[in-house]
């Protein structure tokens, strides 16, 4: 096909036509449609929604829409044998039991198949013992307990508050500390914003509200039984004992009414400092065990959930590119929810639906994108990013050769204050340029650009006059594309004011109260923030799929590489004596970054000057840009994390949600002063510097003139 078939109207007009076609009212309508019943992964309801989306995407005009199914390990509570926690007296009698379900929100009393709160993939068990309060159960919290306070968690049931880090990391930390069970709870300090009412009168968490969620430590593996390969019809599955990332101790979540009953009796050590106190009227004593009068009472967990291999369904839609059909720009977000999914994921799925509709409208008018756009509705994200990971495993050879970019589309909102973007540095300039062209939806910024309101409300800590853009971590479906395959990725959503709202995420996250009404009444009544997110996500996809030269700026990678090298060197320099003793030098890394900077600068100059009418040269330059992210992939992966292969970024080993730079070096340096064999530990630091320096140098060379 000739290139002018792709651009039968001017590119600027195409983008405007695409953006103008996006309507807030449609997003609202789609959100309502997607949130009337639960769509738990592996259930009939979610299969029916997959078929509905398939049908509608076809109607919207996509070239093809297919279901891709996999049989993966999921986890469900036992319907006849509910999970709960009790306080038992010396005779073993249960004198207090936690609630078995959340009180349903108004209007939803008769909805069936609301899964009760549970920690997905918890093993079965009925441990009983003394309680230890471990704050957020972060690495540093257990250091404080074990090293400073000399409190031993071995054989204890620990209670941890949700927030700050991914719940799976909390469970892993508790396991390593020797705990025999974990109770997770939402403290009002983290999930109840001052001056706001509880749902249904406001967006705060009521005392009976509970956060569901998986507690896996998959490290990018996907289905626990088929790591590295798709869970298809002929898959070989590991035995459950060899499954990846499953917790070994029972875990259960509760709300703050129930937590109050457990925490109010706590004795033992006082909290070490104010950062260990939440907002409940309890002492926040660490324990172990209950205070004087109640010292003979214990806590008992009753967990009967089961792990089951279950069929899941992704919806994959294709809009074929007119000029480069073998280059894929992917927009994907998940469809499965814990209950109604009012925010997570359907506020994102509704935006994807409207983006597909707009692209379809343009296609029906005779337009096609230059490159192929793939749209995905992922299943089983809540159970460990399973749908996206299995699909990427099945299609890895195509993706690593043809994948230009992946844009994630989970929740469109987690607040209504300003934009939040996490992406590869390659996309910084794309995001800046796009947001300068979009109108801000914010009050007080009428007639101003989104870039202006975003920069004002969320300024970059390094560069004045620019907005903050964060590193990609994980905990969402971009993981396999970015961390495993090295496909340039990004995500955007509207967020809260992090300075004034210190609660973690949004209060009703993964609770039964995450409804359509929550969004329509309290977060975005006009759906103007949803529309803005649709414009950002859709605009990014449009530019990535349609611009003649890929909108990636490799110079921005050079800038952050220098920043990350400085940061990791400074962390290492906290140990000057050891660095000298073991001859640790970062010279090779700094040198590689310097080379990258110079080569990137020269590449950018050539990019300005080359003959764009020569399709071979154009394709060559675009391929160098496309494959740059791929060049940061180490085929051997990070130590003990083979599916995290990106050398520059990985999810933090202490918090899956957060991104860490130069993760191999960072992890080698972490807590190095406590290592039993310092020579071996510093040897590993040196090896990781070598790997990082080599990778940066190798990536730089992919940008050199080809001959």
């Amino acid at each position: 096909k000739s290139s002018n078939e792709a651009t039968n109207i001017t590119p600027k007009h195409n983008m405007k036509a695409f953006l103008d076609e996006l309507k807030a009212e449609n997003i609202k309508k789609f959100l309502y449609n997607f949130t009337q019943i639960p769509h738990l992964a592996g259930t009939e309801q979610n299969f029916q929604l997959a078929k509905q989306i398939q049908s509608q995407w076809k109607e919207f005009g996509l070239d093809s829409v297919e279901l891709a199914h996999y049989d993966v390990l999921l986890s469900y509570p036992n319907k006849t044998h509910p999970n709960y926690i009790s306080i038992i007296n010396e005779d073993g009698n249960e004198i207090f039991n936690t609630s078995l379900f959340e009180p349903p929100p108004p209007g939803y009393e008769n909805v069936s198949d609301i899964v009760p709160p549970f920690s997905a993939f918890s093993p079965q068990g009925m441990p009983e013992g003394d309680l230890v309060y471990v704050n957020y159960a972060r690495t540093e919290d257990f250091f404080k307990l074990e090293r400073d306070m000399k409190i031993n968690c071995s054989g204890k049931i620990v209670i941890a508050r949700y927030g700050k880090v991914f719940r799976g990391n909390k469970v892993k930390n508790a396991q390593l500390a020797g705990a025999k069970g974990v109770i997770l709870y939402s403290d009002p300090a983290d999930y109840f914003a001052p001056g706001v009412k509880s749902y249904p009168d406001g967006w705060n968490l009521p005392g009976g509200g509970v956060q569901r969620g998986n507690i896996l430590n998959l490290n990018g593996a996907g289905d626990p039984l088929t790591p590295g390969y798709p869970a298809n019809e002929y898959a070989y599955r590991r035995g459950i004992a060899e499954a990846v990332g499953l917790p070994s101790i029972p875990v259960h979540p509760i709300g703050y009414y129930d937590a109050q009953k457990l925490l109010e009796k706590m004795g033992g050590s006082a909290p070490p400092d104010s950062s260990w106190r939440g907002s409940l009227k309890v002492p926040y004593n660490v324990g172990p065990g209950f205070t004087g009068n109640f010292s003979t009472q214990k806590v008992k967990m009753h967990i009967h959930s089961t792990n089951e291999v279950t069929r899941i369904y992704n919806v994959i839609g294709t809009l074929r590119g007119a000029v480069e059909p073998d280059r894929y720009v992917i927009l994907g977000g998940h469809r499965d929810s814990w209950v109604f999914g009012g925010i997570d994921p359907q506020s994102g799925a509704a935006v994807v639906h409207e983006i597909v509709r707009s692209f379809g409208t343009l296609k029906k008018e005779g337009w096609r994108p230059r490159r192929t756009i793939l749209f995905a509705s992922w299943d089983a994200e809540e159970f460990g990013l399973l749908g996206s990971t299995e699909w990427a495993e099945e299609n890895s050879r195509l993706l690593q050769e043809r994948g230009v970019a992946y844009i994630n589309a989970d929740s469109s909102i987690e607040g209504n204050y300003t934009l939040r973007v996490d992406c590869t540095p390659l996309m910084y300039s794309l995001v800046h340029n796009l947001t300068k062209e979009l109108k801000s939806p914010d009050e007080g910024f009428e007639g101003k650009s989104l870039y202006e309101s975003w920069t004002k409300k969320s300024p970059s800590p390094e560069f004045s006059g620019m907005p903050r853009i964060s590193k990609l971590g994980s905990g969402n479906d971009f993981e396999v594309f970015f961390q495993r395959l090295g496909i340039a990725s990004g995500r955007a959503r509207y967020t809260k004011n992090w300075e004034t709202n210190k609660f973690s995420g949004y209060p009703l996250y993964h609770s039964v109260y995450e409804t359509y009404e929550l969004v329509e009444k309290f977060y975005d009544p006009m759906f103007k923030y949803h529309l803005t997110v649709a414009q950002v996500r859709g605009g990014m996809v449009f530019e990535l799929a349609n611009s003649i030269v890929l909108p990636f700026d490799c110079r921005d990678y050079a800038v952050v590489l220098r920043k990350y090298a400085d940061k990791i060197y400074s962390i290492s320099m906290k140990h000057p004596q050891e660095m000298k003793t073991y001859s640790v030098s970062f010279d090779s890394l700094f040198s590689a970054v310097k080379n990258f900077t110079e080569i990137a600068s020269k590449f950018s100059e050539r990019l300005q000057d080359f003959d764009k009418s020569n399709p071979i040269v154009l394709r060559m330059m675009n391929d160098q840009l496309m494959f740059l992210e791929r060049a940061f992939i180490d085929p051997l992966g990070l130590p003990d994390r083979p599916f995290y292969r990106h050398v520059i970024y990985a999810p933090s080993s202490h918090n899956k949600y957060a991104g860490e730079s130069f993760p191999g070096i960072y992890d080698a340096l972490f807590d190095i002063e406590s290592k039993v064999d310092p020579s071996k530990a510093w040897g590993e630091v040196k090896r990781q510097i070598y790997v990082a320096a080599f990778t940066v140098q190798a990536a730089a060379e992919t940008l050199s003139e080809v001959a």
């Epitope: 290492s572 320099m573 660095m579 030098s585 700094f590």
Partner: nanobody, 120 residues
Framework: QLQLQESGPGLVKPSETLSLTCTVS????????YFWGWIRQSPGKGLEWI?????????YYNPSLKSRVTISVDTSKNQFSLKLSSVTAADTAVYNC????????????RGQGTLVTVSS
């Protein structure tokens, strides 16, 4: 022979800013092969690196102290300086300026050190 000499007040009040200057003689501060740094040692504690700077003014700071530290360089005077804000008694130490090979912790020259006491 390269020499480094620290100068500045030996007594600083809590919450105030500690300011020290290091004068380099017998060689130029404008070498790309070296960083110029500050280190300190308090009684019963190990050596603590505070931060470093290169001739172009590029700085590296100890993450634990980063929010309070500023290091600057004046190549015309062959000097570099340390400012540490909001000091407490825990900042009482012997402060040394030093030269080290770029991207390493190989301190090959250092000043004789100056004791700074934080007290009201």
């Amino acid at each position: 022979q390269l020499q480094l000499q620290e100068s500045g007040p030996g007594l600083v009040k809590p919450s105030e800013t500690l300011s020290l200057t290091c004068t380099v003689s017998g060689g130029s501060i404008s070498s790309s092969n070296y960083f110029w740094g500050w280190i300190r040692q308090s009684p019963g504690k190990g050596l603590e690196w505070i931060g470093s700077i290169d001739y172009s003014g590029y700085t590296y700071y100890n993450p634990s102290l980063k929010s309070r530290v500023t290091i600057s360089v004046d190549t015309s005077k062959n000097q570099f300086s340390l400012k540490l804000s909001s000091v407490t008694a825990a900042d009482t130490a012997v402060y040394n300026c030093a030269r080290h090979k770029a991207a390493t912790a190989d301190f090959d020259y250092r000043g004789q050190g100056t004791l700074v006491t934080v007290s009201s």
